[in-house]
Amino acid sequence: MKVLQEPTCVSDYMSISTCEWKMNGPTNCSTELRLLYQLVFLLSEAHTCIPENNGGAGCVCHLLMDDVVSADNYTLDLWAGQQLLWKGSFKPSEHVKPRAPGNLTVHTNVSDTLLLTWSNPYPPDNYLYNHLTYAVNIWSENDPADFRIYNVTYLEPSLRIAASTLKSGISYRARVRAWAQCYNTTWSEWSPSTKWHNSYREPFEQH
């Protein structure tokens, strides 16, 4: 049994780091493998993660941690029984993938303005809470070419757009994702999408 693709890990910078790797053949990850992780610190101890299958030869493990700070560095040991298959390290702050925003809502009752709001996925005492910026994706269900991205570079989790920038009388969907420049993170996954029917009063034309 050998590791074909070494573990790569990302952290949500809150409570979970996810490591993925591939073995050289079909593997029952949960029965055959264990991933041990330990913070490099005098009081810490090793914890065991039981991996799940992620495709035939792929494995994924969710490492639990109560919090993350920028200096944290973990040792990782991948075991198959008594055989050490791989040894490495992981610094969560250097491999951050933020949590996806939630509760995306489209408010359509604000005088021909669409107000999109969502929730910051972090609690106020988490470092990322005040460092997230967002991208909002809006698309038409009827017209695949009607697809747009709005970058929200301010901290408030909301976006206002004129309803008239979208076509009237058709349905749209929106979703939002987050990233944090301070840790040069990857983008989060997209939030679940929300749907609304776009309608607005056409401006009265005077001749």
Epitope: L39, F41, L42, L43, S44, H47, L64, M65, D66, D67, V69, S70, A71, D72
Partner: antibody, heavy 122, light 107 residues
Framework: EVKLAESGGGLVQPGGSLRLSCAAS????????MNWVRQAPGKGLEWVAN????????YYVDSVKGRFTISRDNAKNSLYLQLNSLIAEDTAVYYC???????????????WGQGTMVTVSS | DIQMTQSPSSVSASVGDRVTITCRAS??????LAWYQQKPGKAPKLLIY???SFQSGVPSRFSGSGSGTDFTLTISSLQPEDFATYFC?????????FGGGTTVEIK
């Protein structure tokens, strides 16, 4: 409410013994490293000892090694410090304190008791 | 043992002032440093852990920085309730050790 409450302090003669207790409430006591920290009158803070969640690891400052013993009873949510062969320099307020982290511990103390005074004097 | 040296030992300041306290370790401690505030007759209160991470509930005017041997606690705009003694503490190796303290007094 998360709380620690020390007891057992008092006046003791040099060479004497005391047993300090710390009652924990409002949190999962068995999940945290626990510490004793002392402060002599008008002086700074001095870490004395700590103990792992299950009691299997214990560490002490050199000046109390062989004289003080830290222990815990997770079933009673209690931390203890047995003080033997006391000397005048042990006179201090003794605080119990919780490590803020569980997974992982952080070596920083977020919950403190009100302290109990130990006076060693003849 | 790792010695922790705080400076200054005391500082006089006014409400609204920016106050900086430094802590130097006798050898490298990575980022394993905490800061505490203590008022007379009271137990210490944790402000910062791991050099720069905020303890929940601590006002944002307190911030910590540094790694290795040199660390700083900054109070961006001193408030009346901030007059107290501040201690740093290392957790890189046993025995855990505290700095001697810095007293912030009213000017």
């Amino acid at each position: 409410e998360v709380k620690l409450a020390e007891s057992g302090g008092g006046l003791v003669q040099p060479g004497g013994s005391l047993r300090l207790s710390c009652a924990a409430s409002g949190f999962t006591f068995s999940s945290h490293w626990m510490n004793w920290v002392r402060q002599a009158p008008g002086k700074g803070l001095e870490w004395v000892a700590n103990i792992k969640q299950d009691g299997s690891d214990k560490y002490y400052v050199d000046s109390v090694k062989g004289r003080f013993t830290i222990s815990r009873d997770n079933a009673k949510n209690s931390l203890y410090l047995q003080l033997n062969s006391l000397i005048a320099e042990d006179t201090a307020v003794y605080y119990c304190a919780r490590d803020r982290g569980v997974r992982p511990p952080r070596g920083a103390f977020d919950i403190w008791g009100q302290g109990t005074m130990v006076t060693v004097s003849s | 043992d790792i010695q922790m040296t705080q400076s200054p030992s005391s500082v006089s300041a006014s409400v609204g002032d920016r106050v900086t306290i430094t802590c130097r370790a006798s050898q490298g401690i990575s980022s394993w440093l905490a800061w505490y505030q203590q008022k007379p007759g009271k137990a210490p209160k944790l402000l910062i852990y791991a050099a720069s991470s905020f303890q929940s509930g601590v006002p944002s005017r307190f911030s910590g920085s540094g790694s290795g041997t040199d660390f700083t606690l900054t109070i961006s705009s001193l408030q009346p309730e901030d007059f107290a003694t501040y201690f740093c503490q290392q957790a890189n190796s046993f025995p855990l050790t505290f700095g001697g303290g810095t007293t912030v007094e009213i000017k």
